[in-house]
């Protein structure tokens, strides 16, 4: 009888099925939808989380101006194809043979096409701008306290190395968090900024992916930080390829 059998759950991903039938009675957890083994000591990739979500029962001035090439996820949920490491495949298609290319966070970066569409490589999203508006408070938050609290959150809750939180900007009521991570900077074992941003997004929406952990309770010097609107912009290492028709629409 082992500790694994007493507590066979995945602390970092509630969308898993776990059983104590791994080597030596260890707990083994697999993602819903894909059946892929997940590492419960770190964040699960966004692709596997989206796949699990789609398989689940349906019930449920100092500010940065986003670049002209920044993408916003307007397409919403889809059932993605993930590679053997859990990353998004560069080309995604739906059941009606409509295909498109995505970046490393699974956001569409080309016009939609047919099965002949080619996506040569998975383009990395190296810069993520999280744009938040907080609910009215008695006064503005202290910028350095806010900065420290958000950096702590990404370090402790999402296990993102501090060097990847490039900046925190604040101009009441807007908060912007900049995450930057080039391919060359990301070492083995580093949490991906796309995965951290997705966990943060779900936390902000009150849909925490963590197992049995309370929801996100963000406080700055004891004052609750309640977010009323979130926009996330994704910037890729190679600019997206949309037709002029879409850009002028």
């Amino acid at each position: 009888h082992t500790a694994a059998q007493d507590n066979c759950t995945c602390p970092t991903n509630k969308m898993t099925v776990c059983s104590p039938d791994g080597p030596g009675g260890r707990c083994q957890c697999r993602a819903l939808g894909s059946g892929m083994a997940v590492d419960c000591s770190t964040l699960t990739s966004k692709c596997l989380l989206l796949k699990a979500r789609m398989s689940a029962p349906k019930n449920a001035r100092t500010l940065v101006r986003p670049s002209e090439h920044a993408l916003v996820d307007n397409d919403g949920l889809y059932d993605p194809d993930c590679d053997p490491e859990g990353r998004f495949k560069a080309r995604q298609c739906n059941q009606t043979s409509v295909c498109w290319c995505v970046n490393s966070v699974g956001v569409r970066r080309t016009d939609k096409g047919d099965l002949s569409l080619r996506c040569d490589e998975l383009v990395r999203t190296h810069h993520i701008l999280i744009d938040l508006r907080h609910r009215p408070t008695a006064g503005a938050f202290n910028h350095s306290d806010l900065d420290a609290e958000l950096r702590r959150l990404f370090r402790e809750r999402y296990r993102l190395h501090p060097k990847f939180v490039a900046a925190v900007h604040y101009e009441q009521p807007t908060i912007q968090i900049e995450l930057r991570q080039n391919t060359s900077q990301k070492a083995a074992g580093d949490v991906d900024i796309g995965d951290a941003a997705y966990y943060f997004e779900r936390d902000i929406k009150g849909e925490s992916l963590f197992q049995g952990r309370g929801g996100l309770d963000l406080r700055v010097r004891g004052e609750p930080l309640q977010v009323e609107r979130t926009l996330i912009y994704y910037l890729d290492e190679i600019p997206p390829k949309f037709s002029m028709k879409r850009l002028t629409a």
Epitope: A3, N7, P23, R26, C27, Q28, D39, C40, S41, P84
Partner: nanobody, 121 residues
Framework: QVQLVESGGGLVQPGGSLRLSCAAS????????MSWVRQAPGKGPEWVSY????????YYPDTVKGRFTISRDNAKNTLYLQMNSLRAEDTAVYRC??????????????WGQGTQVTVSS
């Protein structure tokens, strides 16, 4: 870049034997724990053997215990699976995987493309 390439699969009669190999590259093989994982049609993946980095510790589920043997040659960066007394229910795609054990959890993080093993008369 981690690469795992399996070979040795094929068609074998019930009661027969096969030896699978997995050539590893792109990571320090001699310090990595490894597993063999199989997936039968319409079923989820299941681990069938595990070996630690120096080969001193192995684990098998009851379904294959006494019939399968995992081994490794760290000088050749190669993992092996000797399968004896094969049964029809052993039919699956077999993949080698880089693995790790913690006090409580087991996880695989890289897999090969796999080699098909079919047991049929």
């Amino acid at each position: 870049q981690v690469q795992l390439v399996e070979s040795g699969g094929g068609l074998v009669q019930p009661g027969g034997s096969l030896r699978l190999s997995c050539a590893a590259s792109g990571f320090p093989f001699s310090s990595a724990d490894m597993s063999w994982v199989r997936q039968a049609p319409g079923k989820g993946p299941e681990w069938v053997s595990y070996i630690n980095a120096d080969g001193s510790k192995t684990y098998y589920p009851d379904t294959v215990k006494g019939r399968f043997t995992i081994s490794r040659d760290n000088a050749k960066n190669t993992l092996y699976l000797q399968m004896n007394s094969l049964r029809a229910e052993d039919t699956a795609v077999y993949r080698c995987a880089r693995a790790k054990l913690t006090d409580t959890h087991y996880v695989e993080d890289y897999w090969g493309q796999g080699t098909q093993v079919t047991v049929s008369s």
